[in-house]
């Protein structure tokens, strides 16, 4: 009988006939070992490879270019899955990006993405997307034109100020651009007029910081 | 290369009106909020006007209020301030200053036009 | 309106030696979220003013490092480590914290 083929991503695993959202083992191309990745397999069909999550602010997410890299966190809770390893995974195939939103008053959202996928760490790991629909704004609040990676010691944004430093986080900052998925968690009350909370600037606002996040990936042709 | 270039002053007589205009380049210019910053002669700086990205939302000082409007034109990427009723204390240079972050997070200024001198006097 | 206040109004120093320069505000300049929106700009004679420091003390980007923004609340410092000739100008600084912006009435440095 000839040899299952390992699982490249989340919709591999629900193909496989794992249909139940929860944590898998996943082996990307090019990259030495294989990664834990959360597997959202209820959300639209299914087959959802989390790239991002949080939900509770027991993570500290002001890291550095190094830890933004290669993963930070459990992919049981808040996480950040890696640069190399969201480079890697969107090379294999095309891929598309949901990202499920709730603000702090129980609503909940999503923006999604018909193409995604990042450069490589010399491309500052830039962002690439095209066809944005969703509940979470009529605009985009990714930045649709290209943007490259910041964290607090690499400074790759469009702006005369370091957006990394003075909104907390990794992300694909502009000037400093409409959101920042990876800024500073603040709980109910505490979540209005921040300047680097957790934004999605079509969804809530310039300064609302929300309540939890999700960023996923699928395959186009699932 | 961020530009602000203006243009529109000259001499005018007290009461008359001028409009003053900034084009941008170089940037997103819908994406920015907007200020016109002054400096009488030999003074100091005094804001006198805001307009957010969309246009949606505007300021003014409360000693141009009732006589100045700003206003914007995304489409042409310019900046623009009409001024009526002028008086002799308008007299200063008038300069447009881009808001330093976009989407309306307010941190100050990060660019400035080169500044345009409006001289009221009869 | 909040009235905010430089000290001194004029500086002479010597290229090479340090300069400071104070602002003070007639209220907290201390945001809700934590950051106080106090900038500084520089005016060169004959120019534009520029950025020099946001947010009290970051520095905008291809501001030498010898600039340095320190305070909180009310009351706030410019420090230049090491003047040089091209430090020359009307040291401004404005706050945004509380509206309508309002900056205070300007630092001449000069090149003794």
């Known amino acids: 009988r000839e040899e299952e083929k390992p699982f490249r991503d989340c919709a591999d695993v629900y193909q496989a006939g794992f249909n139940k959202s929860g944590i898998y083992t996943i082996y990307i191309n090019n990259m030495p070992e294989p990664k834990k990745v959360f597997c959202n397999m209820d959300v639209n069909g299914g087959g959802w490879t989390v790239i991002q999550h949080r939900e509770d602010g027991s993570l500290d997410f002001q890291r550095g270019w190094k830890e933004y890299k290669m993963g930070f966190g459990n992919p049981s809770g808040e996480y950040w899955l890696g640069n190399e390893f969201i480079f890697a995974i969107t090379s294999q195939r095309q891929y598309m990006l949901r990202i499920e939103l709730m603000d702090w008053e129980g609503n909940r959202a999503y923006s999604q993405y018909d193409r995604f996928h990042i450069g490589n760490e010399k491309q500052n790991y830039r962002l690439y997307l095209k066809g944005h629909t969703g509940t979470a704004g009529k605009q985009s609040s990714l930045i649709l034109h290209g943007a490259d990676f910041s964290t607090k010691d690499a400074d790759n944004d469009n702006c005369m100020c370091k957006c990394a430093l003075m909104l907390t986080g990794g992300w694909w900052f502009d000037a400093c651009g409409p959101s920042n998925l990876n800024g500073m968690f603040y709980t109910a009350g505490q979540n209005h007029g921040k300047l680097n909370g957790i934004k999605w600037h079509y969804f809530k606002g310039p300064s609302y910081s929300l309540r939890s996040t999700t960023m996923m990936i699928r395959p186009l042709d699932f | 290369e961020v530009q602000l270039v203006q243009s529109g002053g000259g001499v005018v007589q007290p009461g008359r009106s001028l409009r003053l205009s900034c084009a941008a380049s170089g940037f997103t210019f819908s994406s920015y909020g907007m200020h016109w910053v002054r400096q009488a002669p030999g003074k100091g700086l005094e804001w006198v006007s805001y307009?957010?990205?969309?246009?949606?939302?505007?300021y003014y000082a409360d000693s141009v209020k009732g006589r100045f409007t700003i206003s914007r034109d995304n489409a042409k990427n310019s900046l623009y301030l009409q001024m009526n009723s002028l008086r002799a204390e308008d007299t200063a240079v008038y300069y447009c200053a881009r808001d330093l972050l976009d989407y309306d997070i307010w941190t100050g200024y990060g660019y400035w036009g080169q500044g345009t001198l409006v001289t009221v006097s009869s | 309106d909040i009235v905010m206040t430089q000290s001194p109004l004029s500086l002479p120093v010597t290229p090479g030696e340090p300069a400071s320069i104070s602002c003070r505000s007639s209220q907290s300049l201390l945001h809700s979220n934590g950051y106080n929106y106090l900038d500084w700009y520089l005016q060169k004679p004959g120019q534009s003013p520029q950025l020099l420091i946001y947010l009290g003390s970051d520095r905008a980007s291809g501001v030498p490092d010898r600039f340095s923004g320190s305070g909180s609340g009310t009351d706030f410092t410019l420090k230049i480590s090491r003047v040089e000739a091209e430090d020359v100008g009307v040291y401004y600084c404005?706050?945004?914290?509380?509206?309508?912006?309002?900056f205070g009435q300007g630092t001449k440095l000069e090149i003794k």
């Open positions: 307009i957010s990205s969309s246009g949606s939302t505007i």
């Open positions: 404005m706050q945004g914290t509380h509206w309508p912006p309002t």
